[in-house]
């Protein structure tokens, strides 16, 4: 799996999308997890509704939300009130029994300032000889922080 980069600005919201084959993953719940160590499992942050038919309903855990368009084949994760501690490696997963297939590996980068990212035409990409090939960077549409929003602490 290549890693897709989503960049957001501290204090704003970041939307991460994970496309998948809707037929292949028909009937499967999805999850969003965080890689907190070099080894060991990806730690679950939030998963879609227990009833697959209700996967379109947004589920929250702290400041992280998940919703699944099962017909269109797009899992969407929203990280609200993005902060530096949200930066890191994540995975979108498709669940079947006790197993989980990785739909997409995601690197979340949290910028201190909207002007800190390079414009799309000016983005620097690692060369093919590097360990992460075909880096793909997305600048998510974000909005200002709502009063009283609290960051979600990482699972320990």
């Amino acid at each position: 799996h290549n890693t897709t980069v989503f960049q957001g600005v501290a204090g704003q919201s970041l939307q991460v999308s994970c496309p998948y084959d809707s037929m292949k993953h028909w009937g499967r719940r999805k999850a969003w997890c965080r890689q907190l160590g070099e080894k060991g499992p990806c730690q679950r942050v939030v998963s879609t509704h227990n009833l697959w038919l209700l996967s379109f309903l947004r589920r929250w855990n702290g400041s992280t939300a998940i919703t699944d368009d099962t017909l269109g084949g797009t899992l969407t994760i929203t990280l609200r009130n993005l902060q530096p501690h949200d930066a890191g490696l994540y995975q979108c997963q498709s669940l079947h029994g006790s197993e989980a297939d990785t739909l997409r590996k995601v690197l979340v980068e949290v910028l201190a300032d909207p002007l800190d990212h390079r414009d799309a035409g000016d983005l620097w990409f690692p060369g093919e000889s590097e360990s992460f090939e075909d880096a793909h960077v997305e600048h998510s549409i974000s909005r200002s922080l709502l009063e009283g929003e609290i960051p979600f602490p990482p699972t320990s």
Epitope: T3, V5, Q7, A10, Q35, L36, G37, E38, Q83, P84, H85, A87, G88, L89, L107, E109, L111, A112, D116, H117, R118, L123, W124, F125, P126, E130, S131, F132, A135, V137, P151, P153, P154, S156
Partner: antibody, heavy 120, light 107 residues
């Protein structure tokens, strides 16, 4: 073993600029971040900012915005920090430090430091 | 900016002792805290991240704890090589900030 090799000490005039290099070895440069940290009087540490070796994205401490500029040369696995319009307040030891994508802000390996002395 | 306060600039200890180095954040930083050790003339070394996760190769006599605003680095069975400066750092909010340091010295 992971190593970050920084350029040597600098003695510069007030108003001049300085460019410090930080060469990484024994790890995949593009999988990590390079942070820059200022240390004065061998005590207090100040985070200047970081550059992503993966995307080239930067984040600066507002205090150093316009003063510091980060760049990377992936072909030589080297990160650079340029410091402009130097004053006596900028005399310090500057460190580069690595962090991983998994823990982007736990700086797990540090360079040996570059001493910058600003003289009038 | 979040201020990380290390109330003890110096702490005296003896070899074999147990010592607690504390750090207080001016606002909630969840568990986004790291601890570093720095010996004279050397670069800082990462000991702990995520408040309690020990970095690879760090002896298990170093333990981190705390969440929210209060954090502690505990060194049990202090060794002579542990005499150094210890800094806490928060990465919950920009800019990332460090404590002023606590110097661990022999009684």
């Amino acid at each position: 073993e992971v190593q970050l090799q920084q350029s040597g000490p600098e003695l510069v005039r007030t108003g001049a600029s300085v460019k410090i290099s930080c060469r990484a070895s024994s790890y995949s440069f593009t999988d990590n971040y390079i942070h820059w940290v200022k240390q004065t009087h061998g005590r207090s540490l100040e985070w200047i900012g970081y550059i992503s070796g993966y995307t080239g994205a930067t984040s600066y401490n507002q205090k150093f915005k316009g003063k510091a500029t980060f760049t990377v040369d992936t072909s030589s696995s080297t990160a650079y920090m340029q410091f402009n319009s130097l004053t006596s307040e900028d005399s310090a030891v500057y460190y580069c430090a690595r962090s991983t994508m998994i823990a982007p802000y736990g700086m797990d390996y540090w360079g040996q430091g570059t001493s910058v002395t600003v003289s009038s | 900016d979040i201020v990380m306060t290390q109330s003890h600039k110096f702490m005296s200890t003896s070899v074999g002792d147990r010592v607690n180095i504390t750090c207080k954040a001016s606002q909630d930083v969840v568990t986004a805290v790291a601890w570093y050790q720095q010996k004279p003339g050397q670069s800082p070394k990462l000991l702990i991240y995520w408040a309690s996760t020990r970095h690879t190769g760090v002896p298990d006599r170093f333990t981190g704890s705390g969440s929210g605003t209060d954090f502690t680095l505990t060194i049990s069975n202090v060794q002579s090589e542990d005499l150094a400066d210890y800094f806490c750092q928060q990465y919950s909010r920009y800019p990332l900030t460090f404590g002023a340091g606590t110097k661990l010295e022999l009684k």
